[in-house]
Structure formats: C-alpha cells, structure tokens
Interface confidence: medium
C-alpha cells in the first residue's frame, strides 16, 4: 500500500491533522523534498548576517556577512571581522603585520616573507606588509645572458573554521 504522503511535493507537508492532505508550508518555512511530514523553519539572517537568498517554500534562506565581515564555516555558520591587507585579526582587533611578515588578504594571519637566501637566491623585490618578497636569480646566475626570475610563492590560504 502506497504511503499517501509520498505524493506531497516539495513546498508542502503531509498534514496528519487533515487526513494526510498535502498542505502548503506555512509562512517562514520550507520543505526541499517531497513526502515531508513537517516543514522546516526558514533561516533568519540577523545581526552581522545579511540575506543572500530569500527563503522560498522549497528552499532555505542563505546568509552572508555584512560589509566588514567574512563568512566562516559551511553555509556561512558565523561571521568574522575583516582586516585590511597588511594586517591580521588579534585579540586587540586588527593589527599591522610585524616586520618580516605579510598578509595579502582581508582575513587570516600574517605569514613570513619568503627567505630567498635559503634557496641561494637574491631578493629581487623586498617584502612589504601586504606582499611577499620576490626572489631573483642566485648571485652565481647573474652572469651575462641569465635572466630567469623565480615567481613568488603563492600566499598560503589560512584555514577558516566555524564556531
């Protein structure tokens, strides 16, 4: 015997109080699959969250973060304050990267400049708070005709995590 609820499409629920009739989801709720016995409450985007996608009868709302914050975690489970390039977020707020470190993003932590001398290279462009050092050829390679330049190592993307 087929379950009558299996005929209820997304956006409805199988209403046990009304002989298992398919009733539309009430306001501020949704069902993303058929055959549901209840509708789920829509996510609200409050505080430093803002609405990226409105809730519909078949899909939940989606939030992102207000300007000055960025999302953390799957589905933007929380928001974290942005800093400027050349800064990192500390317990005292946004602080400039210490000498010898850089951050080329608005989030994450300051990373050490590439140490060109470790690879036997010369420094082609000095590091700044916002950018890594660029290594040039090794002194031994600076003979006439040598012109290769090592591209800078990509900045590591710091891991972000939910609460």
């Amino acid at each position: 015997l087929q379950d009558p609820c299996s005929n209820c499409p997304a956006g409805t629920f199988c209403d046990n109080n009304r002989n298992q009739i398919c009733s539309p989801c009430p306001p501020n709720s949704f069902s993303s699959a058929g055959g549901q016995r209840t509708c789920d409450i829509c996510r609200q985007c409050k505080g430093v969250f803002r609405t990226r996608k409105e809730c519909s009868s078949t899909s939940n709302a989606e939030c992102d973060c207000t300007p000055g914050f960025h999302c953390l975690g799957a589905g933007c489970s929380m928001c974290e304050q942005d800093c400027k390039q050349g800064q990192e977020l500390t317990k005292q707020g946004c602080k400039d990267c210490r000498f010898g470190t850089f951050n080329d993003q608005k989030r994450g932590i300051c990373q050490p400049w590439t140490n060109c001398s470790l690879d036997g290279k010369s420094v082609l462009v000095n590091g700044t708070k916002e950018s890594d050092a660029v290594c040039g050829p090794s002194p031994a390679d600076l003979s006439p005709g040598a012109s290769s330049v090592t591209p800078p190592a990509p900045a590591r993307e710091p891991g972000h995590s939910p609460q």
């Epitope: 973060c65 928001c79 990192e88 891991g159 995590s161 939910p162 609460q163």
Partner: antibody
Framework: QVQLVESGGGLVQPGGSLRLSCAAS????????MHWVRQAPGKGLEWVSV????????YYADSVKGRFTISRDNSKNTLYLQMNSLRAEDTAVYYC???????????WGQGTLVTVSS | DIELTQPPSVSVAPGQTARISCSGD??????VSWYQQKPGQAPVLVIY???ERPSGIPERFSGSNSGNTATLTISGTQAEDEADYYC??????????FGGGTKLTVL
C-alpha cells in the same frame, strides 16, 4: 559522540597561576571555534574567551583580558586556558564548550572548579 | 556588548505556563538561545535561533524574540522543569553574552 573533558582545576593563592585543559573527542576539533565559560559559586554563567579553529584568532571578556590566555593544540585535540594573576573573583567552575552557531550543535564539558583563596 | 536582564526568579504551578523574559537593547536584531541548568550539571541548550528546539527537547519549550525582549515559554510546566534558565545573545560574530539567569520554581 562529542565529548569535552576539562582538567587542571584546583586551589591556588591570589596572584598565582593555573592552566586548564580540555580534551575533545568525537568531532574534527580543528574545524571549530572553542570557548571557555565560567560560573562562580551560586552565580550565573559568564563567557570568558574563544579561539578560532586554527588558533590564530582569540578573544576575551574584559574581566580577564591581559591575565588569561586561550590556546589549543590541534594535534592533541586539546584546548587550554592559562590563567595568571588570579584573583578571588576568578573562583568558579570553568566549562569548555563548543557553542551553537548556525548549522552546528552545542556541547559542554562537565566543568572543573578553580578556587582562588589564601 | 549588549547587557541582558532576566528576572531573578519565576514561580509557576504544575501544568501552568511559565514565561521567562530576557531584555536587552534591540535584542530582536540578534539571535537568542536559552539554556537550562540543574544543580551540579552543565547547561543544556533548550532553544536556539530565537525559537528553534534542539532534538530531544520537549515541545512544551518555545521561544520568541522581538524588539527589546526575548521570552522563553514553558507550557504545561512539569516538576522536572525546575532549574535555572539563562538567555544568551549572539549577533553571528565571535563573542557571546549571557543573561544573569532566572530560577524557575515549580510550586
């Protein structure tokens, strides 16, 4: 299942130091912000500190700023709270917690008692 | 940070409805959670995101939040509901704030 187990509490004199630990299991520890919350005897809950999953970002309540340091060792699935310059008013049960955020559950340890007294 | 104010105590007869308030400046623009704490135990989340119940929490617990007041409502209060209740506000970012707590007595 998620488990949080605090340790390191005890009796300490005013001005002294203590380090609390919280051993976590049952979830990917490094994916989550972790909190310390305390409760003085017969009083309410007070949020103390939080640390990001990577350990790079930390935040503190004004009442402990400059005296307490939160840290974590993701290789050991352990959260820490280093408490220095302790005062009588720091006497409390200290809970380690993974507090609710959107899509994420809420879990607390059983707490460890810190008593600051001479 | 927002300051959350709760009544120190609320009394209710068994089977009646208990309402515990949590007031704070424009608290309706933030998320409110409610915790139940029994003596010697860690707090237990009973309401999150203003009005949602975690699995395992009885349907008699409900929440609302608008303007400057959030409310925890316990319908058909039972003796086992006697406990301390704390509200907590969260704006989606990092830190948290707790209310002072309310002792619920079931007469």
């Amino acid at each position: 299942q998620v488990q949080l187990v605090e340790s390191g509490g005890g009796l300490v004199q005013p001005g002294g130091s203590l380090r609390l630990s919280c051993a976590a299991s049952g979830f990917t520890f490094s994916d989550y912000y972790m909190h310390w919350v305390r409760q003085a005897p017969g009083k309410g809950l007070e949020w103390v500190s939080v640390i990001s999953g990577s350990g790079s970002n930390t935040y503190y309540a004004d009442s402990v700023k400059g005296r307490f340091t939160i840290s974590r060792d993701n290789s050991k699935n352990t959260l820490y709270l280093q408490m220095n310059s302790l005062r009588a008013e720091d006497t409390a049960v200290y809970y380690c917690a993974r507090l609710y955020a959107q899509f994420e559950g809420d879990f607390w340890g059983q707490g460890t008692l810190v008593t600051v007294s001479s | 940070d927002i300051e959350l104010t709760q009544p120190p105590s609320v009394s209710v007869a068994p089977g009646q409805t208990a309402r515990i308030s949590c007031s704070g400046d424009n608290i309706g623009s933030k998320y409110v959670s409610w915790y139940q704490q029994k003596p010697g135990q860690a707090p237990v989340l009973v309401i999150y995101s203003d009005s949602e119940r975690p699995s395992g929490i009885p349907e008699r617990f409900s929440g609302s939040n608008s303007g400057n007041t959030a409310t925890l409502t316990i319908s058909g209060t039972q003796a086992e509901d006697e406990a301390d209740y704390y509200c907590q506000s969260w704006d989606g970012s990092i830190s948290r704030v707790f209310g002072g707590g309310t002792k619920l007595t079931v007469l």
